[in-house]
């Protein structure tokens, strides 16, 4: 999917009014330097593509954060915001629902998540100093 | 572990060529944006070249502009560096370092290779 | 292109003060980082966007820039310190990355 149509202040103040926060609370007990930055972004549809795929695509040791209320959150938003996302989901959220297991919290599943904190930082501070 | 391992230096005759490469691990290279640097003996460090993350756009020194090219693949996670007609003063460490960009302004370099040293000499 | 005036080299004693600076054009209004070399390694980045630090940098190096100077202030010196110091930007006109010369800083 292509998100270079999307509302980004509208998906700016979603984030910052509610998926931050879950992002916190799913974080809770973890140090904010524990986790180094392994992945980035360089524009606000390169950081969705990348928040999009950390968050909804199951990796290694981390079989899946859809369910998280911080994901469930971000689908909302981007199904909101970004022109025909809806569509592109449907097939992925049915293999989703397929593969449902139990929730576990892995120490991937946070260094993840912290990665996607720093995606979301990312997104919400565009204008770096103009040089 | 991230880490960057630059590999492919040597010695090599003034007007010859040769290929400098850097392996990434550790992180998610296709999103960095990435530099090569040199340090020629006993002197500062000189910035030589960078390319986007998508591997769509360089920049280049005025000093190694239309000799050296600077490349990606992203699917192998490596870095290369391609130096023609090559000259005695391009003698020097050649580093490769990860720098997160925004838009087309680079940001600092967290990630350094250990180095590999290149000698131009007849 | 653009153009970064370090000092050659700085001197302190051990348990200073060492204050390292950058000069270049209304360098304010560019985002400065600093990054510290010993003999034979690579470089190491201690503080970035003006005033940041790598979760591995010990608190002792901090920054700051304004006007047409940026400065590294290393506190409380140590023996571990002694390295050459180098500042850099992005030239966002000539898109180049431009670094300083270097300071060697001497702990006596």
């Known amino acids: 999917y292509d998100f270079t149509n999307c509302d980004f202040e509208k998906i700016k103040a979603a984030y910052l009014s509610t998926i931050s926060k879950d992002l916190i609370t799913y974080m809770s007990g973890t140090k904010s330097t524990e986790f180094n930055n392994t992945v980035s972004c360089s524009n606000r549809p390169h950081c969705l593509t990348e928040i999009q795929s950390l968050t909804f695509n199951p990796t290694a040791g981390c079989a899946s954060l859809a369910k998280e209320m911080f994901a469930m959150k971000t689908k909302a938003a981007l199904a909101i915001w970004c022109p025909g996302y809806s569509e592109t989901q449907i097939n992925a959220t049915q293999a989703m629902k397929k593969r449902r297991k139990r929730k576990v919290t892995t120490n991937k599943c946070l260094e993840q998540v912290s990665q996607l904190q720093g995606l979301w930082r990312r997104f919400n501070r565009p204008l770096l100093k103009q040089q | 572990q991230m880490q960057l391992v630059e590999s492919g230096g040597g010695v090599v005759q003034p007007g010859r060529s040769l290929r400098l490469s850097c392996a990434a691990s550790g992180f998610t290279f296709r999103t960095y944006g990435m530099h090569w640097v040199r340090q020629a003996p006993g002197k500062g460090l000189e910035w030589v070249a960078v390319?986007?993350?998508?591997?769509?756009?360089?920049h280049y020194a005025d000093s190694v502009k239309g000799r050296f090219t600077i490349t990606r693949d992203n699917s192998k996670n490596t870095l290369n560096l391609q130096m023609n007609s090559l000259r005695a003063e391009d003698t020097a460490v050649y580093y490769c370092?990860?720098?997160?960009?925004?838009?087309?302004?680079?940001?600092?370099?967290?990630?350094w290779g250990q180095g590999t040293m290149v000698t131009v000499s007849s | 292109s653009y153009v970064l005036t370090q000092p050659p080299s700085v001197s302190v004693a051990p348990g200073q003060t060492a204050r390292i600076t950058c000069g270049g054009n209304?360098?304010?209004?560019?985002?400065v980082h600093w990054y510290q070399q010993k003999p034979g390694q690579a470089p190491v980045l201690v503080v970035y966007d003006d005033s940041d630090r790598p979760s591995w940098i010990p608190e002792r190096f901090s920054g700051s820039n304004s006007g047409n100077t940026a400065t590294l202030t290393i506190s409380r010196g140590e023996a571990g310190d002694e390295a050459d110091y180098y500042c850099q930007v992005w030239d966002s006109s000539d898109f180049l990355v431009v670094f300083g010369g270097g300071t060697k800083l001497t702990v006596l």
């Open positions: 370092s990860r720098s997160p960009q925004w838009e087309d302004i680079f940001e600092s370099m967290d990630i």
């Open positions: 390319i986007w993350y998508s591997g769509t756009t360089t």
């Open positions: 209304n360098i304010g209004s560019k985002n």
